[in-house]
Interface confidence: low
């Protein structure tokens, strides 16, 4: 297993609709044709998998139908969007990239993007 550099922004603020987007960029050392991208969430020293997708270079990034993630790829960049976020989902979101094929296998893990999610204030009741 060979190491690979992965870069991602340090901080992202989710929108009022609970959507956060960030770019995950990897320094590809070879002619990868099959790439796997995994988003991990680290909170209170616990790491959980948020979503994962495998894509072939030049093709779309396909997450599972029920995934909270969507994404697009362009060269060595993956544009990731996580939706449905709430304040309790605030945490460090780590981008893990694996060059699955052809060999050799490369693995890169970013330093993480701290996503801050602020639940919108509920609208005050209106009297008509």
């Amino acid at each position: 297993c060979k190491a690979m550099h992965v870069a991602q922004p340090a901080v992202v603020l989710a929108s009022s609709r609970g959507i956060a987007s960030f770019v995950c960029e990897y320094a590809s050392p070879g002619k990868a044709t099959e790439v796997r991208v995994t988003v991990l969430r680290q909170a209170d020293s616990q790491v959980t998998e948020v979503c994962a997708a495998t894509y072939m270079m030049g093709n779309e990034l396909t997450f599972l139908d029920d995934s909270i993630c969507t994404g697009t790829s362009s060269g060595n960049q993956v544009n990731l969007t996580i939706q449905g976020l709430r304040a309790m989902d605030t945490g460090l979101y780590i981008c893990k990239v694996e060059l699955m094929y052809p060999p050799p296998y490369y693995l890169g893990i970013g330093n993480g993007t701290q996503i801050y999610v602020i639940d919108p204030e509920p609208c005050p009741d209106s009297d008509f």
Epitope: K31, R36, M56, T62, P103, P104, Y105
Partner: antibody, heavy 122, light 107 residues
Framework: QVQLQQSGAELVRPGASVTLSCKAS????????MHWVKQTPVHGLEWIGT????????AYNQKFKGKATLTTDKSSSTAYMELRSLTSEDSAVYYC???????????????WGQGTSVTVSS | DIQMTQSPASLSASVGETVTITCRAS??????LAWYQQKQGKSPQLLVF???TLADGVPSRFSGSGSGTQYSLKINSLQPEDFGNYYC?????????FGGGTKLEIK
């Protein structure tokens, strides 16, 4: 003409290891990946993994990580697969097969070895 | 992992007949599909790749088709040498998996 000549049948004890060989001829060994495939009556054909003879780089089916180790010897154009901690589940016919490098579309497994039968029995 | 479901598991046909074998992938494999023929005690032989391109030396009575998750291999005017086992395999993302096989027997 392209040929992949595999080593002969093996009868091995449970817990032991075995190394299978696949000697390539009729083409430039380093221009193609070497893949290994397992065949049993129960599970059919299963892709084990691949090695790039030029770099020694490997990619494995997660199911066979820790079970199979792929290596090559460029000087003799031979690929090897070591299988360890053998159990009855490893009894199968194992094939080597080549695949063109770096093609993610039209490079497929075009030539196969004749297969090596491995029987694990005490 | 992408699973390949092949059907039928077996079929009997007569020389001269036309048969079709199908393979369904559990996800879109974008035509990254190969078909192999295997005779008893022999190694698999490549028939079709890219879902529809015939490998060198394969007779034109064989044809592959399909897209997305559904693929098929058609054999026109069956010849005695066509009987044996047929397998599909995807090359979309590792691990590359094979279908369970179709045993084509002489009726």
């Amino acid at each position: 003409q392209v040929q992949l000549q595999q080593s002969g049948a093996e009868l091995v004890r449970p817990g032991a290891s075995v190394t299978l060989s696949c000697k390539a001829s009729g083409y430039t060994f380093t221009d193609y990946e070497m893949h290994w495939v397992k065949q049993t009556p129960v599970h059919g054909l299963e892709w084990i993994g691949t090695i790039d003879p030029e770099t020694g780089g490997t990619a494995y089916n997660q199911k066979f990580k820790g079970k199979a180790t792929l290596t090559t010897d460029k000087s003799s154009s031979t690929a090897y697969m070591e299988l360890r901690s053998l159990t009855s589940e490893d009894s199968a016919v194992y094939y080597c097969t080549r695949r063109g490098k770096y093609g993610n579309y039209d490079y497929v497994m075009d030539y196969w070895g004749q297969g090596t039968s491995v029987t694990v029995s005490s | 992992d992408i699973q390949m479901t092949q059907s039928p598991a077996s079929l009997s046909a007569s020389v001269g007949e036309t048969v079709t074998i199908t393979c369904r992938a559990s996800g879109n494999i974008h035509n990254y599909l190969a078909w192999y023929q295997q005779k008893q005690g022999k190694s698999p032989q490549l028939l079709v790749f890219n879902a529809k391109t015939l490998a060198d030396g394969v007779p034109s009575r064989f044809s592959g088709s399909g897209s997305g998750t559904q693929y098929s291999l058609k054999i026109n005017s069956l010849q005695p040498e066509d009987f044996g086992n047929y397998y599909c395999q995807h090359f979309w993302s590792t691990p590359w998996t094979f279908g369970g096989g179709t045993k084509l027997e002489i009726k």
